[in-house]
Interface confidence: low
């Protein structure tokens, strides 16, 4: 069990999404509509995991990690590639260890095999990511 | 109830290719993935590859790659793998499971993958001259 | 061989409790979680415990699993002779990008 003073997360999970992150934690009730908070029963460290695909970056998951582990030392959500579900789109992830830090993200690095989207750094959207 | 229901014992020669199919009954099969596993006799699990039947993305292991190829049907809720170029070291069960990662093709859970929960009943495959 | 590390053995008598252990690397168990299953021997796998330490519907809450860093454990207590199988752990591994099994721990109920 975490510490009492819990780490709170932003959670969400796209439609379609199996298998649920939410036992990771305890809902916190933000008003309607997302985003929603998750305080996190078993680490310090949120995640947040997002699609990005032909330019645009679409959040997939939000939430709590189960256990402390590398990465969530970072005040941030820097994501990284890690895998790639098609040859036109790559999922990016972060972890970061403060409240609400994975929200969003300042800036997707190159994605590898990505094809190339155009001539800027790809970005959610002005304000952040597209939620579904 | 949820089932998977594998296609049946197969001998084959060294070089020849081998196709199983694996149907699914009791769920809408577009909502998940299916993986395919073998074991070789009296060893361990091996994971061969997965398909999202949703949208036909695959992921295969990297020793079978070029060698192996998933597909899906989803007229007839039925999954297949063949595998080319058979060796004598192929002989195994070849197993089919649902898979708990998403059928939507969002990918991998991740940090958060549920495994696998519905398994066939396997189909031997012997390759022998 | 396995990536993943398991004892190929492990014996108790019924009522007992037994741990099984996996042992991985910082590409898999310590950055994914992990799954274990259960074979019976002529038998396709079950599985037993998803995300570390969850139970499907229909396991006995006497099989429970953990997680710490980049090794995992599977607890069986009070065993009974039907758990007499083969026991598998699993992860994601992100260097492979695919998914690994441990080679399996035959677990033997005496008496």
């Known amino acids: 069990q975490v510490s009492p003073n819990r780490r709170t997360c932003v959670f969400f999970e796209a439609p379609g999404v199996r298998g649920s992150t939410k036992t990771l934690g305890e809902m916190v009730d933000a008003g309607p509509g997302p985003p929603k908070g998750i305080r996190c029963l078993y680490s310090h460290c949120c995640f947040g995991i997002w699609n990005l695909t032909h330019g645009r970056a679409q959040v997939e998951m939000q939430g709590c990690r189960d256990s402390d582990e590398p990465g969530c030392e970072s005040l941030h959500c820097d994501p990284v590639p890690r895998a790639h579900p098609n040859p036109s789109s790559t999922l990016f992830t972060c972890s970061c260890g403060t409240d609400f830090c994975n929200a969003n993200y300042s800036h997707l690095p190159p994605s590898g095999n990505q094809g190339a989207p155009g001539p800027q750094e790809p970005q959610a959207t002005p304000g952040g990511p597209v939620w579904m | 109830q949820v089932q998977l229901v594998q296609s049946g014992t197969e001998v084959k020669r060294p070089g020849a290719s081998v196709k199983i199919s694996c149907r699914a009954t009791g769920y809408t099969f577009s909502d998940y993935g299916i993986s395919w596993m073998r074991q070789a006799p009296g060893q361990g699990l091996e994971w061969m590859g997965w398909i999202s039947a949703y949208n036909g993305n695959t992921n295969y292991a990297q020793k079978l790659q070029g060698r192996v190829t998933m597909t899906t049907d989803t007229s007839t809720s039925t999954a297949y793998m063949e595998l080319r170029s058979l060796r004598y070291d192929d002989t195994a069960v070849y197993y089919c499971?649902?898979?708990?990662?998403?059928?939507?093709?969002?990918?991998?859970?991740?940090?958060?993958?549920?495994?696998?929960?519905?398994w066939g009943q396997g189909t031997t495959v012997t390759v022998s001259s | 061989q396995p990536v993943l590390t398991q004892p190929p053995s492990a014996s108790g008598t019924p009522g007992q409790r037994v741990t099984i252990s996996c042992s991985g690397s910082?590409?898999?168990?310590?950055?994914?979680?992990v799954n274990w299953y259960q074979q019976v021997p002529g038998m396709a796998p079950k599985l037993l415990i998803y995300s570390n330490n969850q139970r499907p519907s229909g396991v006995p809450d006497r099989f429970s699993g953990s997680k710490s860093g980049t090794s995992a454990s599977l607890a069986i207590s009070g065993l009974q002779s039907e758990d007499e199988a083969d026991y598998y752990c699993?992860?994601?591994?992100?260097?492979?990008?695919?998914?690994?099994f441990g080679g399996g721990t035959k677990l033997t109920v005496l008496g």
């Open positions: 910082r590409s898999n168990i310590g950055r994914n979680t």
């Open positions: 699993a992860a994601w591994d992100d260097s492979l990008n695919g998914v690994v």
């Open positions: 499971a649902r898979d708990g990662r998403r059928g939507s093709g969002i990918y991998w859970g991740v940090y958060y993958y549920n495994g696998m929960d519905v």
